[in-house]
């Protein structure tokens, strides 16, 4: 009884998680032959989704300390009574701590919304930027490439830092940094296009810090289904932020009568969010939610971390699957609006476009669909996984695999439907994207399960690097290249403009099927890799510092 009181006091978490945490603590206590009363033993009472005893949950507005726990045989805390290092300290109120974690997750999700809002505000006013700076298409491509490349390069660096240093400080600094750069970029004179390119690169670095580290904090604040839910909220920020970015870009431009003002909105919100992160997000220890407390230390080198990740088959296959998602979303996002416009030209419901932007209406509809399907996909994926976990331990990768394979079918149908019905094509896009986006949060959750806490930031970073490198960094260009190649061997006509792009885009469903296969491969190794990660976590938490991971 003492244990459950302690767990609920610490967490205010879900009952099933408390029970699960209790079972794990009993098991670990038995393994170690730990003394102490009840289930708390040598571990202390870390409730589901919250730090173990002995952790100090710090915010700028104060800190909550709970009972320190020594290794077996050392004087620990009798029962689960939370003691403080100063006189008159009280047990924290359960609800406030639960609310605190909820607030932290909300702030982190808001930060992610802003990350994508900032990125897509630029996309929303890209034509204006091109017009103002006299940027050619290759220049616009350079802006995109510089952003992605700097993001890719910076991600592993922040992964390394995120596993070793204060994450919320890195997060806040990242937000402050990209906010300042974006704000400054709105004042770049027309002749300094290179400064605009540089600013996009710097924004990529700033945003990499966030995308890499924020999910790992959520991973350390919550466990099990609560973590899935919170990661779902966090990843829903991607379509929400993207959609809001387009809206912000165009509406602020119209309201102010000058596109420059569009780039001054997200930095202001960014500064506020960065400050809120510093104040409200607890400086969680790695492995908080895994009941590891102070005992879990990062003892491995970056090289060893990388070797361990590359040997982790579930991680490798899920990362390759994520690359397939990234490949498809990057290519479809760039080319589908133009493809649908060309379809309408063939159907004689639209004129041939000689002066860009071509397919502006289609871009808007596609953007709205992407935004909504992102939300629907994340919710569907999280819900399906929750339900499937009751049936199988391999639920996470299997749900992703089914989503991917189902998505491939509907992406194929886009090209069938577009020949005769634009509405039909949009329906296929809707279903296909919903299924494609259903694995966003689950993939992050898979990573949390199979990677130990001290490697999670590095793992997220490497996965981010891989998915960009093999995915959206090259897919838009590859599709364009294939389309041009097909067109060169055919006669110049609106029909072949439409067909050549359609044939090129058919590469996407094949890549998505490949991604589905990678998720099925993940399912093969998921249970064993998850068990190995749990075992390593248990070993790391044990007193001998010589444990090799």
């Amino acid at each position: 009884m003492m244990c459950l009181e302690c767990a609920s006091a610490a967490a205010g978490g879900a009952e099933e998680e408390e029970a699960d945490a209790e079972r794990r603590r009993r098991r670990r206590g038995a393994q170690r032959g730990a003394g102490g009363s009840g289930c708390c033993g040598a571990r202390g009472a870390g409730g589901a989704g919250v730090s173990a005893a002995g952790d100090e949950v710090q915010t700028l507005s104060g800190s909550v300390r709970r009972a320190p726990t020594g290794p077996p045989g050392t004087p620990g805390t009798p029962g689960c009574a939370a003691t403080a290092k100063g006189p008159g300290a009280q047990q924290p109120k359960p609800a406030s701590l639960g609310r605190g974690r909820g607030a932290a997750a909300a702030i982190l999700s808001l930060g992610n919304v802003l990350n994508y809002l900032d990125r897509y505000t630029v996309a929303g006013v890209l034509l204006d930027i091109q017009q103002h700076f006299g940027v050619k298409d290759r220049g616009a491509g350079l802006l995109q490439s510089v952003f992605i490349c700097s993001f890719m390069v910076a991600a592993p660096i922040f992964g390394y830092l995120g596993d070793r240093f204060n994450r919320k400080v890195i997060l806040s600094c990242g937000i402050f940094f990209w906010s300042a750069v974006t704000f400054s970029s709105s004042f770049i004179p027309q002749q300094y296009f290179w400064a605009l390119v540089l600013s996009r690169g710097l924004v990529g670095i700033g945003e990499a810090s966030y995308s890499t580290i924020a999910p790992t904090i959520i991973g350390d604040l919550f466990t099990k289904n609560t973590r899935t839910l919170m990661l779902s909220v966090f990843y829903f920020a991607i379509p929400l932020g993207s959609g809001l970015g387009y809206i912000t870009g165009s509406s602020v431009k119209q309201a102010a009568g000058d596109w420059h003002w569009a780039l001054r909105v997200s930095p202001v919100l960014g500064m506020i969010t960065g400050t809120l992160i510093l104040i409200l997000v607890p400086a969680t220890k790695r492995g908080h939610a895994d009941q590891l407390g102070d005992q879990l230390k990062a003892r491995t080198s970056w090289l060893r971390d990388m070797k361990a990740l590359i040997r982790n088959r579930s991680y490798v296959f899920s990362s390759l699957a994520t690359s397939a998602v990234s490949f498809a979303t990057g290519a479809l996002g760039m080319w589908i609006p133009l493809y649908l416009h060309r379809a309408q030209v063939v159907q004689k419901t639209a004129e041939t476009c000689n002066s860009p932007p071509c397919g502006a209406k289609d871009s808007l509809i596609f953007g709205a669909i992407t935004c909504f399907t992102g939300f629907l996909g994340v919710v569907t994926g999280a819900g399906a996984t929750r339900w499937c976990r009751l049936k199988t331990q391999r639920a996470d990768p299997l749900v992703c695999a089914v989503g991917m394979l189902g998505s491939a079918i509907f992406i194929c149908l886009i090209f069938v439907a577009a020949k005769s019905s634009i509405v039909g094509a949009y329906i296929c896009i809707f279903v296909g994207e919903t299924l494609l986006f259903s694995n966003w949060a689950i993939t992050a959750d898979i990573l949390m399960y199979v990677v130990i806490p001290t490697r999670r930031a590095t793992a997220v970073a490497l996965q981010s690097f891989t998915s960009h490198l093999l995915g959206d960094a090259g897919s838009p260009y590859l599709i364009g290249f294939i389309s041009d190649l097909i067109r060169q061997s055919t006669k110049d006509s609106p029909l072949w403009e439409f067909l050549s792009l359609g044939y090129a885009l058919m590469l996407c469903p094949f890549v998505v099927v490949l991604g589905g296969m990678f998720f099925l491969a993940t399912a093969l190794f998921f249970v064993s890799d998850r068990a190995r990660a749990e075992q390593q976590v248990n070993q790391l938490a044990m007193p001998p510092a010589s444990v090799k991971v």
């Epitope: 091109q130 017009q131 103002h132 700076f133 006299g134 940027v135 050619k136 298409d137 290759r138 220049g139 350079l142 004042f187 004179p189 027309q190 002749q191 296009f193 390119v197 002066s355 860009p356």
Partner: antibody
Framework: EVQLVETGGGLVRPGSSLKLSCATS????????MSWVRQAPGKGLEWVAL??????????NYAESIKGRFTISRDDSKSRVYLQMNTLRDQDTATYYC????????????????WGQGVMVTVSS | DIVLTQSPPTLSVTPGESVSLSCRAS??????IHWYQQRSNESPRLLIK???QSIAGIPSRFSGSGSGTDFILSINRVESEDFSVYYC?????????FGPGTKLEVK
Amino acid sequence: EVQLVETGGGLVRPGSSLKLSCATSGFTFSDTWMSWVRQAPGKGLEWVALIKDKNSNSEANYAESIKGRFTISRDDSKSRVYLQMNTLRDQDTATYYCTRHEDFYYYSGYYFDYWGQGVMVTVSS
Amino acid sequence: DIVLTQSPPTLSVTPGESVSLSCRASQGISTSIHWYQQRSNESPRLLIKYASQSIAGIPSRFSGSGSGTDFILSINRVESEDFSVYYCQQTYSLPLTFGPGTKLEVK
């Protein structure tokens, strides 16, 4: 040496059409944005139309006063830029200059770094 | 459309004097202003780009300054070949527009 040579000017009646041509040499034409600028007798300079390069989808931009009547086009194989002028009016009487925009590969300046010698177009009944 | 106003319309100076020609924009245009010289019966030529950047082959006595809405073209010690019409042009936004010009004449 950069050279821009305009041809095709002359005396025409209001409502009629005329096509100006600008032959270029001394630079990579296909990568360069080109414009037409005009100057009415004894008056100031007025930008007429701009055509971007193929890397910008050969996008065209026009001054409000000639929109719908004039069309700018280019032929990269001949290194020529054209200005098709339809429904000409008295106020279109001017010297028409073919101009080049300075190119920086990834982007282009909107100012004119080279000008042709100009061609006179007179619209009169 | 951005309107450019040049002043004075005509400026009379003696050779060897230094002069400043003004160009004012109807709204802030950062440094997106360019200066051209047009001698009698000749095509215009670019003197200064982006408010202050010099152009190869243009004498160093020509310099530009300003940002936002107010811009200056300075000619240090005017020479006889400098007597011509000077135009400013904005490239901040389309349509591209020119100022009405300032005529520099011999006093």
